[in-house]
């Protein structure tokens, strides 16, 4: 298992919510991506393939997510101060071999300007 800080902008704020970007290499065909808050699994998305390049997506812990050919974005809404924490992208690569797990993450800072419902 490889641990490290994300070497890209992992958190993108908009409209009182945050998009958490979890990247994976372009060559990865089948994988599981989990979003961890501390040690707790918040979100889970698995992409698998079949013959004829048919793709299947499985979400055990459902979050609003968006899949591209090199990233999974998880969206958290209605931010408040309790969202401040370490977040990790836990990537399990099934295909191509060898099986590999990588963990990258960063700290989500919550500032007044990013809160969903600021008190006036």
């Amino acid at each position: 298992e490889i641990n490290g800080s994300a070497n890209y902008e992992m958190f993108i704020f908009h409209n009182g919510g945050v998009q958490i970007l979890c990247k994976y290499p372009d060559i990865v065909q089948q994988f599981k991506m989990q979003l961890l808050k501390g040690g707790q699994i918040l979100c889970d998305l698995t992409k698998t393939k079949g013959s004829g390049n048919t793709v299947s997506i499985k979400s055990l812990k459902f979050c609003h997510s968006q899949l591209s050919n090199n990233s999974v974005s998880f969206f958290l809404y209605n931010l408040d101060r309790s969202h401040a924490n370490y977040y990790f992208c836990n990537l399990s690569i099934f295909d191509p071999p060898p099986f590999k797990v990588t963990l990258t993450g960063g700290y989500l800072h919550i500032y007044e300007s990013q809160l969903c419902c600021q008190l006036k």
């Epitope: 065909q29 698998t48 393939k49 079949g50 013959s51 048919t54 499985k58 295909d95 191509p96």
Partner: antibody, heavy 124, light 107 residues
């Protein structure tokens, strides 16, 4: 402990049908892609068919395409193989096997746990 | 389809000796989708190696796999009595296909 138990084998005449079952326990069944692999006693192994975690994706060896149908019932932790238009060359021990990674895929994955097999004999 | 050829068909060795099993593919096995299985009489196959060189969970380190493209090797460093069995290679990219097997028996 992971267990895969096949059943449904037997003796059948050419042109006949059989339905094999594989009952899984000790695992979260819908985390796994599953396959059927057969072996003529004393001979080598032949992959027959595979299915992904929810049954969306399936595939077959050319030798059984159009005659065999793989399916699964995750609520019952069970895998099935419906075998129609059976031929003498389908005589074999049939194993079910799960994907090694728990990826939910049968595609581009090796198999780790296997059952003990169920014997199918096609003979007139 | 990719056809796999295994050699030798039978390997007669003594416990403690080194076993070298070969698997050759008719065309390149992409991304090393190559696995090795062990099968003993009356038992189901057991996964030893996947991705050409990665040991499966619980497999002792006397088993090792190597190779890429069309030529792959399974090495058993020091044969234990329980290692005498039939060994199959398998390419598992797209439609899986198994080799005919190599029997390792006691000399």
């Amino acid at each position: 402990e992971v267990q895969l138990v096949e059943s449904g084998g037997g003796v059948v005449r050419p042109g006949g049908s059989l339905r094999l079952s594989c009952a899984a326990s000790g695992l979260t069944f819908d985390d796994y892609g599953m396959s059927w692999v057969r072996q003529v006693p004393g001979k080598g192994l032949e992959w027959v068919s595979g299915i992904n975690w929810n049954g969306d994706n399936t595939d077959y060896a050319d030798s059984v395409k159009g005659r065999f149908t793989i399916s699964r019932d995750n609520a019952k932790n069970s895998l099935y193989l419906q075998m129609n238009s059976l031929r003498a060359e389908d005589t074999a021990l049939y194993y079910c096997a799960r994907d090694y990674y728990g990826s939910g895929s049968y595609y581009n994955v090796p198999f780790d746990y296997w059952g003990q097999g169920t014997l199918v004999t096609v003979s007139s | 389809e990719i056809v796999l050829t295994q050699s030798p068909g039978t390997l007669s060795l003594s416990p403690g000796e080194r076993a070298t099993l070969s698997c050759r593919a008719s065309q390149s096995v992409s991304s090393s989708y190559l696995a090795w299985y062990q099968q003993k009489p009356g038992q189901a196959p057991r996964l030893l190696i996947y991705g050409a060189s990665s040991r499966a969970t619980g497999i002792p380190d006397r088993f090792s796999g190597s190779g890429s493209g069309t030529d792959f090797t399974l090495t058993i460093r020091r044969l234990e009595p329980e290692d005498f069995a039939v060994y199959y290679c398998q390419q598992y990219g797209s439609s899986p296909f198994f080799g005919p097997g190599t029997k390792v028996d006691i000399k």
